[in-house]
């Protein structure tokens, strides 16, 4: 039975130019961590896992950069980043929990986090 | 069943290169990573690289960084060591082996080539 | 890097004995440590992961058991084909780490 739960950073904007920490934290659950993969849309950004360390996609690799922790970092953000992000964190033996963040880039500097919120 | 055949075995001349094949028969690269270990005559395990072909990016060991290459080519399912600079206790039999990406990588180093020996020696 | 030490390095055991090989890192890895066995002259295979599930195809006199920085392998009752080299591996933290060995002779 999986009991765990995500939480993410939720709903969050940054300016253009810019970059931006997507973070998911898994909970409430005694399951190994195998591996996180993060993605966009359908497009796998960055895989994780200690057998491998971190991997960037090549597509992405000069844009984007592990950590904090399992989290990732977007930099020279442009709004075509605007969209769904996924963290995806596939463990043993519940199975793979996701979490979803919403990434806004704006033009101006009315960039402003959101709140942090729960995926069950 | 996929099995990961290796290249033959190989005598070198210290301070020069080495490069090992591993070819998944029977499967692709698809939702894999391959690692690389090695075992030095009576020796243990040692851990030296891995690379994720989907990506074909690679992270090494410290101890073999700047002396060891890993890569993969997606087309013929084959992945390559190459160890330049090679001295006397770069003798050892090396070994590739298969690791779960996503849900299954818990399973760890499942399947592994039969190991290519390479010997350094003047 | 974690370190795993593995004890004893060796050992000799008569066919039909109860065989433990412990394993202990030098940091908690909670239960992100696999077992292979290795026999002269062929590659390592998987036996146990996550500290105590058994691979398929592996025959259930062998167990594994810990978790934190203490694991144990267990063989219930040693048979001819079980004499052979058991290493221990964590892939808890980047980069995975073996321990030294465990060579399990005929007494």
């Known amino acids: 039975m999986m009991t765990g739960t995500i939480e993410t950073t939720g709903n969050i904007s940054a300016e253009k130019g810019g970059s931006i920490i997507l973070q998911c934290h898994l909970s409430s659950t005694t399951a190994q961590v195998t591996q996180v993969n993060w993605e966009q849309q359908d497009q796998l950004l960055a895989i994780c896992n200690a057998d491998l360390g971190w991997h960037i996609s090549p597509s992405f690799k000069d844009r984007v950069a592990p950590g904090p922790g399992l989290g990732l970092t977007l930099q020279s953000l442009t709004v075509n980043d605007t969209g769904e992000y996924f963290c995806i964190y596939h463990t043993y033996p519940d199975g793979t929990y996701t979490g979803r963040i919403f990434l806004e880039v704006l033009e101006s500097s009315v960039a402003e986090h959101g709140a942090r919120f729960q995926i069950p | 069943q996929v099995q990961l055949v290796q290249s033959g075995a190989e005598v070198k001349k210290p301070g020069s290169s080495v490069k090992v094949s591993c070819k998944a028969s029977?499967?692709?690269?698809?939702?894999?990573?391959i690692s690389w270990v090695r075992q030095a005559p009576g020796q243990g395990l040692e851990w030296m690289g891995v690379i994720v072909p989907i990506f074909g990016t690679a992270n090494y060991a410290q101890k073999f960084q700047g002396r060891v290459t890993v890569t993969a080519d997606e087309s013929t399912s084959t992945a390559y060591m190459e160890l330049s600079s090679l001295r006397s206790e770069d003798t050892a039999v090396y070994y590739c082996?298969?690791?779960?990406?996503?849900?299954?990588?818990?399973?760890?180093?499942?399947?592994w080539g039969q190991g290519t020996t390479v010997t350094v020696s003047s | 890097d974690i370190q795993m030490t593995q004890s004893p390095s060796s050992l000799s055991a008569s066919v039909g004995d109860r065989v433990t090989i412990t394993c202990r890192a030098s940091?908690?890895?909670?239960?992100?440590l696999n077992w292979y066995q290795q026999k002269p002259g062929k590659a390592p295979k998987l036996l146990i992961y996550a500290a105590s599930s058994l691979q398929s195809g592996v025959p259930s006199r062998f167990s594994g058991s810990g978790s934190g920085t203490d694991f144990t392998l267990t063989i219930s009752s040693l048979q001819p084909e079980d004499f052979a080299t058991y290493y221990c591996?964590?892939?808890?933290?980047?980069?995975?780490?073996f321990g030294g060995g465990t060579k399990v002779e005929i007494k």
């Open positions: 029977g499967g692709t690269f698809q939702n894999y990573a």
């Open positions: 940091q908690s890895i909670s239960s992100y």
């Open positions: 082996a298969r690791l779960h990406l996503g849900q299954k990588a818990y399973y760890g180093m499942d399947v």
């Open positions: 591996q964590q892939r808890y933290v980047f980069p995975p780490t």
